[in-house]
């Protein structure tokens, strides 16, 4: 009955040697796909000469191959009842699911502009940067390949810094040959409501980015929870994207290839403002661009990027305050399309398919010595691009899992 | 308070160097950059270059490349300025100075100077 | 680079009257101009800074005004301990330039 049903699962989803869990956990059976919406400024010299609201138009989607590399450094340790791993990073382009190519060109925000003018407010260095920006002739916005924009293109103004600095920039840079973590996570051995849940990240229990409780990280990777989810559940994961834990709650009961499956998604609650969601208080860190911590919708997580203004939202900045993109012109929000999701089989508590949205922004202010920011008026968080990360169990592997697990229990 | 104390007044040969100081007190020294000026006498000022006193990050006038290096001690809080291959136009009055960042305030604390004096 | 000219190069007053210097920029620097007054064997001492922003500790008889390429520093009535050279210096652009001086005197 349900009893042996129960012991087979608490079994099967242990993160050790053997088990369907972890020859699916090491090395994802599922196609994961990352696409890209660029968004292409429309009026350069208007924003830069006026400061008028910024006419974006967004093109995409560019698709990546992403995920596809086996963990590294897998190590259990079976003193703790943990696993540590290392998970690589590679991203193969597929045209054939893109629009385009990445020889695409885009109008986008100068980011090295935008950040060195940010991280260095000492208006003599200003000076020295104006120098270098004129010198090098970079501008508020500048025209870059899809894979300089992604993936790095050495910049020219940061080129001429007779200093070592990294002199090439990228919204994603680096990125191949790199692995994220080292994550340490609890293989459920000797308690299975811990499996997949993070003991460690880089060593540590705690991020540093940001106080109190934000700085705490929760849950699992997303990837797979504890077996026996409730629709009752806050499901609770890190992101190492976003610099930040976060949670999803039940939306609804969904029928995945004839899985039931269970639809949970990123509430709009959390990305509220504390005065909304008290909770959120640390997670706002200046008082200037959060209007005293009213506006919402947008994360600074500059200090989790080496000080550069990186804001990151939902897609279109849905759920985000007006005044936030109110200087924007050409964004369209939709739940349906901009939210996230994960579609949890709720026995194994594997997630069967996901849609992970964010978009990544860049604040960029006036500034009186920088030549090319001179005549802004007001800040800008200014959106780059959007992303729609997605991944959906096999059919092959969908029938297996009917037969193996879902058949089973009905 | 804050105090820029500059070394004493110095006689050089042409074509030889010098190298002076400024020892910063009554304040944390890599907080800020120091600034020299030069004013040859009874003439106007001219602005050298600054260093960053944090990372030793050097800016200079166009008209001092080559001729004024400037470089600091951390450990003793003291800025040193050193001039090459000196000619009468280097006979001046040179001063380290320091500024209030942030504010938009240039030169705002400046040293007593240190006269060099270029004579055979 | 920005030129600054300066004028006029010298004047004399008699105590208690007014005193205008002048200073044009040959690129708009906006209001990023500051006043400096050097007394015989001391250094500058900063007057006045960016934004027309008198120091703290300096009298109110000293001013400034001007935008763009056309600034004047201003002394109203002027007295003995004022005698001194003026600088102008412009902290817009790369290399920052001073004026050539002004060189007050009392008649």
């Known amino acids: 009955g349900d009893l042996l049903i129960q012991k087979t699962i608490k079994k099967q989803v242990v993160l050790e040697e053997g088990t369907i869990a972890f020859k699916n956990w090491v090395k994802t059976g599922t196609e994961v796909y990352r696409q890209f919406w660029i968004f292409d400024v429309q009026n350069p010299q208007e924003v830069m000469m006026n400061s008028s609201n910024i006419q974006v138009k967004q093109r995409g989607p560019y698709t990546y191959r992403v995920r596809f590399l086996a963990k590294e450094n897998v190590t259990q340790d079976a003193e703790d009842n943990t696993v540590s791993f290392l998970q690589p990073n590679g991203a193969i382009f597929e045209p054939s699911l893109s629009v385009g190519t990445e020889a695409d060109n885009f109008t986008v925000l100068n980011l090295a502009v935008a950040a060195a003018s940010h991280i260095y407010q000492n208006q003599f260095v200003q000076m020295i940067l104006n120098s270098l920006i004129n010198k090098s002739k970079s501008s508020m916005f500048q025209v870059r390949t899809l894979r300089e924009l992604l993936w790095g293109y050495r910049d020219p103004f940061l080129s001429l810094v007779p200093y070592p600095v990294t002199t090439t920039v990228g919204l994603f840079y680096p990125y191949n040959n790199t692995a994220d973590g080292v994550y340490k996570v609890f293989n459920g051995k000797d308690n299975i409501s811990k499996v997949a849940i993070i003991d460690t990240y880089k060593g540590k229990r705690n991020l540093s980015y940001w106080e109190s409780h934000c700085d705490m990280i929760n849950g699992t990777d997303a990837a797979s929870f504890p077996p026996f989810v409730e629709k009752s559940q806050v499901l609770q994961f890190f992101s190492s994207d976003i610099c930040r834990s976060i949670y999803a709650v039940f939306e609804s009961d969904v029928n995945l290839k004839g899985i039931p499956v269970y639809r949970f998604v990123l509430p709009s609650k959390a990305f509220a403002s504390p005065v909304e969601n008290p909770d959120n208080y640390c997670f706002c860190t200046e008082k200037i661009i959060s209007k005293n911590c009213t506006s919402y919708g947008v994360l600074d997580i500059s200090k989790c990027k080496e000080g550069r203004p990186v804001y990151i939202s939902l897609p279109h900045f849905l759920y985000a305050s007006p005044d936030v993109s109110e200087p924007i012109d050409g964004l369209n929000p939709n739940e349906e399309e901009h939210r996230t999701y994960l579609d949890i089989e709720p026995i194994t508590g594997f997630t069967l398919q996901f849609a992970k949205r964010l978009q990544v922004n860049l604040l960029v202010k006036p500034s009186e010595k920088i030549q090319v920011l001179k005549n802004l008026k007001r800040n800008y968080i200014v959106p780059i691009l959007w992303l729609n990360e997605t991944g959906t169990i096999g059919d092959e592997k969908a029938n297996m899992f009917r037969s193996q697990v879902t058949g089973k229990i009905n | 308070q804050v105090q820029l104390q500059q070394s004493g007044a110095e006689l050089v040969m042409p074509g030889a160097s010098v190298k002076m100081s400024c020892k910063a007190s009554?304040?944390?020294?890599?907080?800020?950059?120091m600034h020299w000026v030069k004013q040859r006498p009874g003439q106007g000022l001219e602005w050298i270059g600054s260093i960053d006193t944090s990372d030793s990050y050097t800016t200079y006038s166009q008209k001092f490349k080559g001729k004024a290096t400037l470089t600091v001690d951390e450990s003793s809080s003291t800025a040193y300025m050193e001039l090459a291959r000196l000619t009468s136009e280097d006979s001046a009055i040179y001063y380290c100075?320091?500024?209030?960042?942030?504010?938009?305030?240039?030169?705002?604390?400046w040293g007593q100077g240190t006269l060099v004096t270029v004579s055979a | 680079e920005t030129t600054v000219t300066q004028s006029p190069a010298s004047l004399s007053v008699a105590t208690g009257e007014k005193v205008t210097i002048r200073c044009i920029t040959s690129t708009d620097i906006d209001d990023d101009m500051n006043w400096y007054q050097q007394k015989p064997g001391e250094p500058p001492k900063l007057l006045i800074s960016e934004g027309n922003t008198l120091r703290p500790g300096v009298p109110s008889r000293f001013s400034s005004s001007g935008y763009g390429t056309d600034f004047v520093f201003t002394i109203e009535n002027t007295l003995s301990e004022d005698v001194a050279d003026y600088y102008c210096?412009?902290?817009?652009?790369?290399?920052?330039?001073f004026g050539a001086g002004t060189k007050l005197e009392l008649k």
């Open positions: 210096l412009q902290s817009d652009n790369m290399p920052l330039t």
């Open positions: 009554g304040y944390t020294f890599t907080d800020y950059w």
């Open positions: 100075v320091r500024g209030e960042d942030y504010e938009g305030t240039w030169f705002a604390y």
